[in-house]
């Protein structure tokens, strides 16, 4: 008889979830030579174990403490790059201006971009059907608890001027339910970080909208200043033009605003 | 003139509810966060709740955590706190204040007094 | 109790320098945001320092600094106008919340 298996509202866990993990950790450290001390096996094991057995609501950032030592990895902290719903410009960005880092380009960010993963309680298995949703079911669940646990530590890392690239296309430019609304702005520590610059990237080859008046940046502006953090804004009014801009920086289209 | 201007205090017995206001002019009310503080006869200042600029983000004090909310109408340009099961202890004069980026809570309105009594 | 300690009063003579203490924690005054109020008899508080810079109209008599998890408020050359009680506030960001301290109450003798 086949037992009774709760039904979570997300989707399950990414299917070969397991060796998708190990791989990206192989692929890691072959290519960063920093972190080729990593024992991709324990990580795995560090990784299952923060989730396998546990009911997948009641996940804690305990759970993934063995993890994080594992993954614990220097990245400059003053190169660190933000984002907020504007992931894949970010990673371009970064892939491009190769000093800089988002959190996917350190290895635990790396090793968990884009998956969805959960067990059960007091079962052994790995639940492929169906995984908690934030926000119909529960936000204490692995994957939520995950990003929670190193986007904090990413931004507690970060010191002189730190970046956020802000999607300029949607309602709220900075929105308080993102991550990086409401983990990371809140875990900049002001005695390292001397400014926050965003960059707020526009959607509309015709948008010449001043974005960084928008009261969601003003918004921003106000946290951060009650932390004695310094605020920055700019409009990146051309977001190919500004790729294009990063690769080839003497190129005399370049000089003027993007 | 920038000015805040408070209204809505009064008599109210312990368990009931007053609606306060605060009417901002003279300066662009829809830029900025801002407060309720409040001082109890003879005591010091208590800071009471905030509001963020577009209404996202609210702040309270733990002394009034479930049964004060505070709201804004930027269209309006008024602040709103809204007291419900009021207390003794609630017993003050209440002032709304802006709060400038980096500055501080640099405009204050004149505050209206909240009296809990039976 | 306030979060922020600051002594209940302080006395000086006119012309003279008082200075009036406020001591908090990581979480406020050594990270974030430090302001003073004055409030005068009978009116509502007025901004008087953010942080260590004055706003615009208050006389440079007044002076602010910051050290570690305490802040202070100096008044130089002392006024008979300068008697009121003094608050210092902080952002909180334990709380997330602004916290004041109990006031001094400022008596020019």
């Known amino acids: 008889v086949p037992r009774w298996r709760q039904q979570w509202s997300g989707p399950g866990t990414t299917k070969r979830f397991p060796e998708t993990v190990l791989a990206r950790c192989v692929k890691y450290t072959e290519i960063h030579p920093e972190m080729r001390h990593v024992d991709c096996q324990s990580v795995w094991d560090a990784f299952k174990g923060a989730f396998i057995s546990k009911h997948p609501c009641n996940i804690t950032e305990e759970d993934y403490q063995p993890l994080m030592k594992l993954g614990t990895q220097t990245v400059p902290c003053n190169k660190i790059l933000l984002w907020s719903r504007i992931k894949d410009l970010a990673h371009q960005f970064t892939q491009v201006q190769r000093d800089m880092f988002t959190l996917e380009d350190t290895l635990l960010g790396y090793l968990a971009d884009d998956l969805t993963w959960c067990g059960e309680f007091n079962t052994s298995k790995i639940n492929y059907q169906s995984c908690p949703d934030w926000r119909k079911d529960c936000s204490n669940n692995p994957v939520s608890v995950f990003w929670k646990t190193v986007s904090r530590r990413f931004a507690e890392a970060a010191c002189d001027v730190v970046h956020v690239m802000l999607n300029g296309s949607r309602s709220k430019i900075f929105d308080k339910n993102s991550t990086f609304g409401s983990v990371e702005v809140h875990n900049l520590q002001p005695e390292k970080v001397q400014t926050l610059e965003a960059w707020v990237i526009h959607g509309g080859r015709e948008d010449s909208r001043d974005l960084c008046q928008d009261p969601t940046i003003k918004e921003l502006e106000s946290i951060i200043s009650k932390r004695n953090i310094q605020f920055s804004c700019k409009n990146i009014y051309r977001p190919d033009k500004f790729l294009q801009c990063v690769k080839n920086p003497e190129d005399s289209s370049c000089t003027s605003e993007i | 003139e920038v000015q805040l201007l408070e209204s809505g205090g009064g008599l109210v017995q312990p368990g009931g509810s007053l609606r306060l206001s605060c009417a901002a002019s003279g300066f662009t009310f829809s830029d900025y966060e801002m407060n309720w503080v409040r001082q109890a006869p003879g005591k010091g200042l208590e800071w009471v709740s905030a509001?963020?600029?577009?209404?996202?983000?609210?702040y309270y004090a733990d002394s009034v955590k479930g049964r004060f909310t505070i709201s804004r109408d930027n269209s309006e340009n008024t602040l709103y706190l809204q007291m419900n099961n009021l207390r003794a202890e609630d017993t003050a004069v209440y002032y709304c204040a802006n709060y400038k980026s980096y500055y501080g809570m640099d405009v204050w309105g004149r505050g209206t007094t909240v009296t809990v009594s039976s | 109790q306030s979060v922020l300690t600051q002594p209940p009063s302080a006395s000086g003579t006119p012309g003279q320098r008082v200075t009036i203490s406020c001591s908090g924690s990581?979480?406020?005054?050594?990270?974030?945001?430090v302001n003073w109020y004055q409030q005068l008899p009978g009116t509502a508080p007025k901004l008087l320092i953010y942080?260590?810079q004055r706003p615009s109209g208050v006389p440079d008599r007044f002076s602010g600094s910051k050290s570690g998890t305490s802040a202070s408020l100096a008044i130089s050359g002392l006024q008979s106008e300068d008697e009121a009680d003094y608050y210092c506030?902080?952002?909180?960001?334990?709380?997330?919340?602004?916290?004041f301290g109990g006031g001094t109450k400022l008596t020019v003798l």
């Open positions: 509001i963020s600029i577009t209404g996202s983000w609210t």
């Open positions: 942080n260590t």
């Open positions: 506030a902080s952002w909180d960001a334990s709380l997330n919340a602004w916290v």
């Open positions: 990581r979480s406020n005054i050594r990270n974030n945001l």
